[in-house]
């Protein structure tokens, strides 16, 4: 057992251009507080077990009001250390998240408002009992300077706080088989304290609190013989060869107690003794409450007014995990509709919309046919962020409002003259040509290259183009 300690030295603008604006103002005074979350191990998988080593919240810092026109200085900090007690061995490698929060003290409806100012994270190796380690982390334009260490709580010592020390019983030497405790030479390494009730004859331990059985013995306290000649074992199927009852699997086999809980058998089942901070039949529920502020990144904590009721963090989109400690790649959700390009700027999500679409998420189809009329009998054709009007004969333009000049394209061939007509155009063909657009030459003998002119039409007569 031991304590991880974090000392915040300063929080303020980092070096370089683009100094951040002060988070507080005369109109909106505020104060800072910090939150630390620890997880064992260096691997990314450690993120899946939020704050498994523990978490702590600092006190609130002094109230700060920005001086008008002054650059943001280092902000006043809360007094004291942040302390995260750990019950078991110190893992040696750990991941941390440190968050800087702002508490606004203006006339807020429903009390002060909290908002996350900065969040830093890292992975480190650290031996318990060592000196303070110094660190600088940057989050955007902010810079956080801090120190940290892990120290063991007596009687534990060592780089993992797993060895136990006791004051010497004799001034000159330690007991048989026990070494002096470095660096506390005036103390002796104590024998390991096994799980309470562990059989001294048939059980032993290599870690505090465990009970491992010698061959031939079983049960959580190594008090049950594996096979009894007296055949009085209280459970298990009958053995056909010996006629004795051989113990079957016990309720504590495989240890059903989660989160470091210890299992003990009861007449009917088993009972878990849970470590501090956990509860439930199998120690599966964390005893942290909403009062501890367990939800990161603006997550809303629900339930958990007392240690006997669980809390749930409702995460804002963009964060997930049981404590809202993990940032989601918001663009992976493809929030930009209609082919828009997604940009996750960290502080905000932006969509760059394709032509014809608008809105924060490109949800507004500017060019759809809804409420858009095509004039003069035209019909609206929609598709892919663009709309067009299919115009009735004689009309054109985007909304079919322009009267089309059917002669503008010079449709009459071979020098034919074009006349606009209410239902289209008429070509008056030059001598020697015929057809709707004067496209066919007339042979010298007066016969058309076509099979025949329509009845009533002489070659050279104007023909209407429909």
């Amino acid at each position: 057992a031991g304590v991880f300690e974090l000392q915040i030295h300063s929080f303020g603008p980092g070096p370089g251009p683009g100094a951040p604006r002060s988070p507080c103002s005369a109109r909106l005074p505020c104060r800072l507080f910090f939150r630390v979350c620890l997880k064992p191990g260096l691997s990314e998988e450690a993120a899946e077990s939020p704050c498994a080593l523990g978490a702590a919240l600092s006190a609130r810092g002094p109230v700060y009001t920005e001086q008008p026109g002054a650059p943001a200085p280092d902000l006043p900090l809360p007094d004291g250390l942040l302390q995260v007690p750990f019950r078991d061995a110190w893992p040696g490698t750990f991941s941390f998240i440190i968050e800087t929060w702002r508490e606004e003290l203006g006339d807020q409806i429903g009390g002060p408002a909290w908002s996350l100012l900065a969040r830093v994270a890292g992975r480190r190796r650290l031996a318990a009992g060592g000196p303070w380690a110094r660190d600088i982390q940057r989050a955007g334009a902010w810079e956080l300077r801090f120190s940290y260490r892990a120290r063991c709580e007596p009687p534990a010592v060592g780089t993992a706080c797993t060895r136990l020390c006791r004051p010497r019983s004799a001034p000159s030497r330690c007991g048989p088989g026990l070494r002096p405790c470095a660096p506390l030479e005036d103390e002796c390494e104590a024998p390991l304290v096994c799980r309470a009730g562990c059989s001294p004859e048939h059980g032993f331990c290599e870690q505090p609190g465990e009970c491992r059985c010698l061959e031939g013995w079983t049960g959580p306290l190594c008090t049950v013989p594996v096979s009894t000649s007296s055949c009085l074992s209280p459970r298990g199927p009958s053995s056909a060869t010996t006629g004795c009852l051989v113990p079957g699997p016990g309720p504590c086999d495989g240890n059903p107690c989660a989160n470091g809980g210890s299992c003990s058998e009861t007449p009917r089942s088993f009972e878990c003794t849970c470590p501090r901070g956990f509860y439930g039949l199998r120690c599966e529920v964390s005893g942290v409450t909403c009062a501890d502020g367990p939800c990161f990144n603006g997550g809303l904590c629900v339930g958990g007014a007392d240690p006997d009721s669980a809390y749930i963090c409702h995460c804002p989109p963009g964060f997930q995990g049981s404590n809202c400690e993990k940032r989601v790649d918001r663009c992976s959700l493809q929030p930009c509709r209609n082919g828009g390009l997604c940009l996750d700027l960290g502080h905000a999500l932006r969509c760059r919309c394709r032509a014809g679409f608008a809105g924060p998420r490109c949800e507004h189809d500017l060019d759809d046919c809804a409420g858009r009329a095509c004039a003069n009998g035209g019909t609206c054709v929609e598709g892919g962020g663009a709309h067009r009007c299919s115009c009735a004969l004689g009309f054109g333009g985007r909304d079919c409002r322009e009267r089309a000049d059917p002669c503008a394209a010079r449709p009459c061939a071979h020098g034919g003259r074009c006349y606009a007509h209410f239902s289209g155009l008429v070509c008056a063909c030059a001598p020697g040509y015929m057809g709707a657009r004067c496209e066919f030459p007339v042979h010298p003998d007066g016969a058309s290259a076509l099979p025949a002119a329509p009845p009533g039409l002489r070659p050279g007569d104007p023909q209407r183009y429909l």
Partner: antibody, heavy 121, light 107 residues
């Protein structure tokens, strides 16, 4: 706990006006867009209007465009719907509903109990 | 506007039954489909957003699936408190539109 409470409904004659209010609590109001949705007697839900968290983006259904105005006062945690030129077909229960954070999904994740508007001569 | 067609408009089922409600959009809504539950005299509740994501506090017997234009809400084992009217809503393109609703009644 997120809470939305509508008020301001009542009986009004065709062509008349009404102003609905929605009081919000239990969340940071200025972080969320809000919708108005209505439900005519015995009918389904119909989206009416939307205003973004800062009030910069406003949308209306075609059926109310030009007659209804949505607005908000973040300092008072309040949303409003000014309804003018009311018609019989505007008779409905009007709900305010919170949009999702950052409008990624355009959901309506928490709803009020509604206020009844009756347009009749 | 995108039309949302929900079916069936009503169904009768017993406690423990598996219930499936479908919603069809008139064009691709790229999974921006949400499901709501409405009970008389109670506030409307969001159940599922973005086709398949369960809203906080919603029991895991509710699930959603689909893509393109066709979407489904499934209640794996109907409970007494699930008798209500269910609506789908598309959040892809303005105006936001709802399906006509499906009333789930006790058989």
């Amino acid at each position: 706990e997120v809470q939305l409470v509508e008020s301001g409904g009542g009986l009004v004659q065709p062509g008349g006006s009404l102003r609905l209010s929605c009081a919000a609590s239990g969340f940071t109001f200025s972080d969320y867009g809000i919708h108005w949705v209505r439900q005519a007697p015995g009918k389904g839900l119909e989206w009416v209007a939307y205003i973004s968290s800062g009030g910069y983006t406003i949308y209306y259904a075609d059926t109310v465009k030009g007659r209804f105005t949505i607005s908000r006062d973040n300092a008072k945690n309040s949303l409003y719907l000014q309804m003018n030129s009311l018609r019989a077909e505007d008779t409905a229960v009007y709900y305010c509903a919170r949009g999702d954070y950052e409008d990624i999904f355009y959901t309506m994740d928490y709803w009020g109990q509604g206020t009844t508007v009756t347009v009749s001569s | 506007d995108i039309q949302m067609t929900q079916s069936p408009s009503s169904l009768s089922a017993s406690v423990g039954d598996r219930v499936t409600i479908t919603c069809r959009a008139s064009r691709d809504i790229t999974k921006f489909l949400n499901w709501y539950q409405q009970k008389p005299g109670k506030a409307v509740k969001l159940l599922i957003y973005y086709t398949s994501r369960l809203h906080s506090g919603v029991p895991s017997r509710f699930s959603g699936s689909g893509s393109g234009t066709d979407y489904t809400l499934t209640i794996s084992s109907l409970q007494p408190e699930d008798f209500a009217t269910y609506y789908c809503q598309q959040g892809n393109t303005l105006p936001w539109t709802f399906g006509g609703g499906t009333k789930v009644e006790i058989k």
